[in-house]
């Protein structure tokens, strides 16, 4: 009767501080227009990292500004978070909402946890 | 905030027009396919018409199949329900939603009658 | 025009439990989701139990919701003066490839 999102549970952000992991999606609806968002957990409060929509014959597209790529595929949407740093470990949960045409569902993944581990300077090179 | 505001309700004859407008502001109107629900005097609510956020797909109950159409102009943040051949049974509150029927507006109404 | 049923009216005291319940078919709510929304006099619609079963944002978890079989129902507990509005709910019918509404509840704090 719902919809579920499914998402790795841990993924590790690369030294460069960009992480990736899919966000799959299934129903028994025919979605034409998908939207995706990025929420991150920490504690009790939940905040949007990005969101976009998208038609399921387009490309995901973000906002110019955002910190989020992706692309999809069916109902797989390949996110990827950029700028990521030690202080962005968390868990990150990814929101599918199906919104046109009717009927409106939405789900939402148990969370990806994402760790970021800053990388050490390089020494000085006499 | 996030806010719709319905306009373009009145009293008009059968087989008048009338064309209604939602605003919105508050969030990205562009990124989010909108709803008009009805309803009448004493009635309970009617979803009516649907569009996709680029408003090139619309869907919409058989009652008002060829009479009313949406639309939307997302430069100027708006969506639209134009009335044609108004019948007495479509006498109601107009209220726009977003598709996700987290927010509605407030409701124009229109009252047809001779 | 209303295709789930739902009682005219309720009544309830301060601080007291109500339900509302909402009745459809093995098309509509026995296949799919039941949102509920609430209406004070003279404004729009205000969503109270998403399509999900989830409280919308800002509503108290004084607000309840259950479901079995064909009839849903939402439950308010430690009714508060603010909480005297109309009750919508509503449903996607497969059949009738459509939303559909229940007729309204309207509850009355005593």
């Known amino acids: 009767k719902g919809m579920h999102a499914a998402q790795p549970a841990v993924v590790l952000a690369s030294s460069r501080g960009v992480a990736s992991f899919v966000c799959e999606y299934g129903s028994s609806g025919n979605a034409a227009e998908v939207r995706v968002t990025m929420l991150r957990q920490a504690g009790s409060q939940m905040t949007e990292v990005c969101a976009a929509t998208y038609t399921v014959e387009d490309e995901l597209a973000f906002l110019d500004d955002s910190t989020c790529t992706g692309t999809s595929s069916g109902n797989k949407v390949n996110l990827t978070i950029q700028g990521l740093r030690a202080m962005g470990t968390g868990l990150y949960i990814c929101k599918v909402e199906l919104m046109y045409p009717p009927p409106y569902y939405v789900g939402m993944g148990n969370g990806t946890q994402i760790y970021v581990i800053d990388p050490e300077p390089c020494p000085d090179s006499d | 905030e996030v806010q719709l505001v319905e306009s373009g309700g009145d009293l008009v004859k059968p087989a008048g027009s009338l064309r209604l407008s939602c605003v919105a502001s508050?969030?990205?109107?562009?990124?989010?396919?909108m709803n008009w629900v009805r309803q009448a005097p004493g009635k309970g609510l009617q979803w009516i018409a649907g569009i996709n956020s680029g408003g090139s797909s619309t869907s919409h109950i058989d009652a008002i199949k060829g009479r009313f159409t949406i639309s939307r102009d997302n430069a100027k943040n708006t969506l639209y329900l134009q009335m044609n051949s108004l019948r007495a049974e479509d006498t109601a509150v107009y209220y726009c939603?977003?598709?996700?029927?987290?927010?509605w507006g407030q409701g124009t109404l229109v009252t047809v009658s001779s | 025009q209303a295709v789930l049923n739902q009682p005219a009216s309720v009544s309830g005291s301060l601080g007291q439990r109500v339900t509302i319940s909402c009745t459809g078919s093995s098309s509509d709510i026995g296949k799919s989701y039941v949102a509920w929304y609430q209406q004070l006099p003279g404004t729009g619609p205000r969503t109270l139990i998403n399509?999900?079963?989830n409280r919308a944002s800002g509503v108290p978890d004084r607000f309840s919701v259950s479901r079995s079989g064909n009839t849903a129902t939402l439950t308010i507990s430690g009714l508060q003066a603010e909480d005297e509005a109309d009750y919508h709910c509503?449903?996607?019918?497969?059949?009738?490839?459509?939303?559909?509404f229940g007729s309204g509840t309207q509850l009355t704090i005593l």
């Open positions: 399509v999900d079963g």
């Open positions: 509503s449903s996607w019918d497969w059949s009738l490839h459509t939303y559909v």
């Open positions: 508050g969030f990205s109107f562009s990124s989010y396919a």
């Open positions: 939603a977003i598709s996700n029927w987290a927010y």
